[in-house]
Interface confidence: medium
């Protein structure tokens, strides 16, 4: 072993090019130059190294830079980046959104990687907020990556960066995480006018309040049930037969296929049968002729 | 279906050449890495040289070197292999062969896809 | 070069016998990939990266082994598994094939 130390004469790699796939595992070790590799990272991605190659390149990266690597070796890294760990990704500054979109490149196409999460963490916490650049580019890579993120993590996005969001990209946020962006959303989009408002912000309204679902019942929006069915319950109940008819528009027919499951369920629960019965949908379950309605969450509210 | 067709061997003199091309089809032809690999008469298999995507990195195997020449055309979907300085010992099967598209888009290490192959005869 | 070396170069085997063939490569390498040839047909794909069947291939082949020493399986025979099988790795440069397995009718 103590003579494969030593690189073999005629051997020292000059540069970084095909002649070196070539090298067993112990010639590129003792034949290439960290600080050339260093330099030359951008050749190294057009090279067919091997796995095992590989390894041994990122061992003279991690030699020479054992604080972390700097930017402009992490933007060159390519495929490289895939042999990297967390724990090697925390050490490092990323400043540029340029190196995020080669790193993110890579990992194009499949799951985010627990690499993948510690790099967009460390470049986020490093720009201080989402902003409307940055959320661009991971909602163009990732388009599930705003709902990964906790209601704290998405308190510091502001409002501008909203422009960017697709309605895709909120498939699968959850309640709580709307309840965040929404008046981000209403914010961002406050100056459009009611149609183009409406187009805006209907991905958002699963954090949208009682109130502001009343005001959109008088816009004439029409509201398809699949929007409905992820409205809040809670902003739902409080709404009347009449803003329910209006808000939804021809929509509304589409109330009976949905009478068993929430929030429609709950809402029928909470209406006169009366009303229900104006719809002419058959809608069953409302509260029966002379019963009394005690709203219990107000009479909580005012004691 | 994904196809790999090859064509262009032939029967060739010591020190003759020879242009092997290969179609294909079924697949979007600009994102692999291409290989040729040989199979002489009787015997195993043999890689002979790989291009990548964009026609920047090309590998020979040492025993060709100098005298094989790879190319591609994307526009075309075909391979290429130029053969000057012909020996008899490289009368052999000529495959067209892809490079596996891995996990992560890293060329892998193998051949996922092979053409028929052309036969290359070299004797005087 | 890493040489591999597949044994045994013949095995004569029956219909629904179990075939157990072999590569040793000359020194380690991280995968081993197997091809299957019929006879004026080019190889197919059958395991990659060790263990991993390609598509198409029927769940009775299988793939094991590490460093130097791998294996291909084929748990019952059926009558168009006859053929020769090479095993092949990319570990380092160039890429390289065994000699081959040629697995034939008892």
């Known amino acids: 072993e103590v003579e494969k130390t030593a690189c073999p004469s005629g051997k020292k790699a000059r540069e970084i090019d095909e002649s070196l796939i070539f090298y067993k595992k112990w010639e590129l070790e003792a034949c290439v130059d960290a600080a050339l590799l260093a330099t030359q990272m951008d050749r190294v991605n057009a090279i067919p190294f091997t796995y095992e190659q590989l390894d041994v390149l990122k061992h003279k990266l991690d030699e020479l830079y054992p604080q972390g690597y700097p930017e402009s070796v992490i933007q060159h890294l390519g495929y490289l980046f895939l042999k990297m760990s967390p724990e090697d990704i925390r050490k490092w500054n990323v400043t540029s959104l340029e190196t995020l979109k080669a790193l993110l490149e890579v990992n194009k196409g499949h799951e985010m990687s627990p690499q993948v999460a510690t790099l967009i963490d460390r470049f986020v916490k490093g720009r201080g907020q989402l902003d409307k650049d940055t959320l661009d580019t991971l909602t163009a890579f990732y388009p599930g990556y705003l709902c990964s993120l906790s209601p704290e993590e998405l308190s510091s996005v502001p409002p501008s960066s909203i422009w960017a969001v697709r309605p895709q990209d909120l498939d699968t946020c959850d309640p709580r995480q709307l309840d965040v962006l929404y008046p981000k959303a209403r914010l961002a989009f406050q100056n459009m006018n009611g149609s183009e408002y409406f187009v805006k912000i209907q991905s958002f309204l699963g954090g949208a309040p009682t109130e502001d679902l009343k005001a959109l019942s008088q816009q004439n929006v029409s509201m398809d049930l699949a929007t409905f069915m992820k409205l809040r319950t809670d902003a739902v109940l409080p709404l009347t037969v009449a803003e329910v008819q209006k808000l939804l528009g021809p929509h509304v027919e589409g109330l009976k296929a949905e009478e068993r499951h929430r929030p429609v369920r709950d809402w029928i629960l909470r209406q006169r049968q009366d009303d229900l019965d104006t719809l002419g949908l058959g809608l069953q379950g409302g509260i029966p002729n002379g019963y009394l309605v005690l709203d219990l969450s107000m009479q909580e509210a005012l004691s | 279906e994904v196809q790999l067709v090859e064509s262009g061997g032939g029967l060739v003199q010591p020190g003759g050449s020879l242009k092997l091309s290969c179609a294909a089809s079924g697949f979007d032809f600009s994102r692999y890495w291409m290989s040729w690999v040989r199979q002489a008469p009787g015997k195993g298999l043999e890689w002979v040289s790989e291009?990548?995507?964009?026609?920047?990195?090309?590998v020979y195997t040492p025993s060709v070197k100098g005298r094989f020449t790879i190319s591609r055309d994307n526009a075309k979907n075909s391979l290429y292999l130029q053969m000057n300085s012909l020996r008899a010992e490289d009368t052999a099967v000529y495959y067209c062969?892809?490079?596996?598209?891995?996990?992560?888009?890293?060329?892998?290490?193998?051949?996922?896809?092979w053409g028929a192959g052309t036969t290359v005869t070299v004797s005087s | 070069d890493v040489v591999l070396t597949q044994s045994p170069a013949t095995l004569s085997l029956s219909p629904g016998e179990r075939a157990t063939l072999s590569c040793r490569a000359s020194?380690?390498?991280?995968?081993m990939y197997w091809h299957q040839q019929k006879p004026d047909q080019s190889p197919k794909l059958l395991i990659y990266?060790?263990?991993n069947l390609a598509s198409g291939v029927p769940v009775r082949f299988s793939g094991s082994g590490s460093g130097t020493d791998y294996t291909l399986t084929i748990s019952s025979l059926e009558p168009e598994d006859f053929a020769v099988y090479y095993c092949q790795q990319w570990s380092s440069y160039p890429p390289t094939f065994g000699g081959g397995t040629k697995l034939e009718i008892k």
């Open positions: 062969a892809r490079r596996g598209s891995h996990y992560y888009g890293y060329r892998t290490g193998y051949f996922d896809v």
């Open positions: 020194s380690s390498v991280s995968y």
């Open positions: 291009i990548n995507p964009d026609s920047s990195t090309i």
């Open positions: 990266d060790t263990s």
